[in-house]
């Protein structure tokens, strides 16, 4: 069945029951999620707007799917598997009496159920299993999840130690001065130049020393971590964003709505699911996309690709390539594309590498 | 390449039955719920049956509950929909359509085939 | 139970226009609407999903928005192959339709 191909999951509670006070709902959803945090690498993060990738939901009856509720007692709750719209969406029947204790129906306990469906479980037949298909009360002091819940949900995605194959284990800042640090996505933003790590970017004014790291979720609460390719069009004051098959219009600095969007509007073939880097060229008009060993030039102002593409990255950027991380346009002449840990300034009018530096190098390490 | 090909579809008299079958092919059948949507001539679209992956659970439009049920055989990747005590009202071009979702439905369907018509008169 | 209620039921434009149609359901539906386009003796094609996400292989000149109740598909600048009937759709229930006609 479906999973979410990411570590990093954002929920949003849409709507409050009002059998419970707003913070105990809160907590018992929060402590639903840590459940399965504590035995997988996933990370959940509570977002208050825009489009999160689980949506909790309180409603009665009809309510927007084809699985009406049917009262008190019967379907508590439901919920969709992992993917894109109502995919990961938890549904919990308001003609229930929901609680914090044995009386009614303890919310956490549903919860925890409910947010194993979002991931991707389906039931158990343990009975001592969370995912049993049943509810039964237990003391939720004591509560633990079965062998099995554990079983299943590693089966999805690991345990918390794969933590540590991933390139931020613990969700904490990377060490900017690392020799061996390497960038997710790298643009310029006016004078400013960003680039991507994960959850983070640092923030280079030009010619200032200084740098300053930020969570992306702290400027644009609606983007995801891990962007993976970023290009700007000053004269528009538009930065886009991308990450998988998806990407994101930020104009002056704040997101646009009805994003995001399929990078397969740009006229990419199906089988490209993902952009590695991208670059503007305001001399030319012309947007460079990096996938995998190749590269696509898409007319800005035509709002289509260039013919002829796409072509191979080494045959064009020499010395560049087969696969590139990240790349930015700089002083009208020059692309600085990153390749793990190593940066090389390429001159595109001379079309040859004039320099090359460490990733960080513009840290002052 | 999905693909669904309908058929089954034909001149049918009131009080009459017809089956209709979707083939499919392209993607994996089994996961997916699968569903039949109808449009009367010159009219809009009309959800009339959904069946879950496994048959287990099957939802009907209420203009035709008690008289179609729908039916999938996973191994031979094809949906089913028996029409019985057909009506003139029935008449309409019936489409097969994918879910994108397999436990619950979504209800969203990102793949349908050409349709078959259904005339339903005497 | 649940109703959707699509406007205007038909509309003319002219190539290069901005078209906006809208979809209404009488109670909250979250963000669980879809649009689909349908040209004369043709399938429908999905073209937003979740009310603003853009199906693969589609333009980017189509784009929905809404939560809630109230919806809308935007077409920024129409095009020739854009004049067709389109559907909002909420789980099993669809819309009336919008039919886009050249002025």
């Known amino acids: 069945g479906p999973v979410w191909r990411k570590h990093y999951i954002t929920y949003r509670i849409n709507n409050y029951t009002p059998d419970m006070n707003r913070e105990d709902v809160d907590y018992a959803i929060r402590k639903a999620f840590q459940v399965w945090s504590n035995v997988t690498p996933l990370k959940f993060s509570k977002i208050n707007t825009g489009m999160a990738d689980i949506l909790v939901v309180f409603a009665r009856g009809a309510h927007g799917d084809f699985h009406a509720f049917d009262g008190k007692g019967g379907i508590l709750a439901h919920a969709f598997g992992p993917g894109s719209g109502i995919g990961g969406d938890a549904h919990f029947d308001e003609d229930e009496f929901w609680t914090t204790h044995s009386g009614g129906t303890n919310l956490f306990l549903t919860a925890v159920h409910e947010i194993g469906h979002s991931l991707g479980l389906g039931h158990s037949s343990d009975p001592k299993a969370v995912m049993f298909p049943t509810y039964k009360y237990v003391d939720i002091n004591t509560f633990r999840l079965s062998a099995d819940d554990i079983r299943g949900i590693q089966s999805l995605y690991g345990d918390p130690k794969e933590n540590q194959r991933l390139p931020n284990p613990d969700n904490s800042e990377p060490a900017l001065c690392d020799p061996n640090l390497s960038f997710d996505a790298v643009t310029t933003v006016g004078n400013k130049i960003f680039f991507f790590k994960d959850r983070f970017f640092w923030l280079k004014v030009s010619e200032r020393p200084k740098t300053s790291v930020n969570l992306i979720s702290s400027l644009w609460p609606t983007l995801p971590s891990g962007i993976e390719a970023a290009y700007e069009i000053e004269a528009r004051n538009q930065v886009f964003l991308f990450k998988d098959d998806k990407y994101w219009l930020i104009s002056n600095l704040r997101p646009e709505p009805n994003y995001p969007k399929s990078i397969h509007s740009f006229g990419f073939p199906n089988f490209v699911k993902k952009i590695d880097a991208a670059v503007f060229n305001p001399r030319f008009y012309r947007t460079y996309f990096f996938v995998d060993n190749q590269y696509w030039r898409y007319d800005e102002r035509r709002q289509m690709m260039d013919p002829g593409y796409p072509k191979l990255i080494t045959k064009n950027f020499q010395g560049i390539g087969p696969k590139i991380d990240a790349v930015f346009y700089s002083k009208n002449k020059y692309y600085y594309f990153f390749q793990g840990s190593n940066q090389f300034e390429y001159d595109f009018l001379l079309q040859r590498i004039t320099k090359t530096l460490k990733s960080n190098s513009w840290f002052g390490c | 390449e999905v693909q669904l090909l309908e058929s089954g579809g034909g001149l049918v008299q009131p009080g009459g039955s017809l089956r209709l079958s979707c083939a499919a092919s392209?993607?994996?059948?089994?996961?997916?719920?699968m569903h039949w949507v109808r449009q009367a001539p010159g009219k809009g679209l009309e959800w009339v049956s959904g069946?879950?992956?496994?048959?287990?659970?099957?939802l009907y439009a209420d203009s035709v509950k008690g008289r179609f049920t729908i039916s999938r055989d996973n191994s031979k990747n094809t949906l089913y929909l028996q029409m019985n005590s057909l009506r003139a009202e029935d008449t309409a071009v019936y489409y097969c359509?994918?879910?994108?979702?397999?436990?619950?439905?979504?209800?969203?369907?990102?793949?349908w085939g050409r349709g078959t018509l259904v005339t339903v008169s005497s | 139970d649940i109703q959707m209620t699509q406007s205007p039921s038909s509309l003319s434009a002219s190539v290069g226009d901005r078209v906006t149609i809208t979809c209404r359901a009488n109670?909250?539906?979250?963000?669980?609407l879809n649009w689909y386009q349908q040209k004369p003796g043709k399938a429908p094609e999905l073209l937003i999903y979740?009310?603003?996400s853009l199906q693969s292989g589609v333009p980017s000149r189509f784009s929905g928005s809404g939560s809630g109740t109230d919806f809308t598909l935007t077409i920024s600048s129409l095009q020739p192959e854009d004049f067709a009937t389109y559907y909002c759709?909420?789980?099993?229930?669809f819309g009336q339709g919008t039919k886009l006609e050249i002025k």
């Open positions: 359509a994918k879910d994108i979702r397999g436990a619950y439905s979504s209800g969203l369907f990102d793949y």
């Open positions: 392209g993607f994996t059948f089994s996961p997916y719920w």
């Open positions: 069946i879950s992956p496994s048959g287990g659970n099957t």
């Open positions: 109670q909250s539906i979250y963000t669980y």
């Open positions: 979740a009310a603003s």
């Open positions: 759709q909420q789980a099993g229930i």
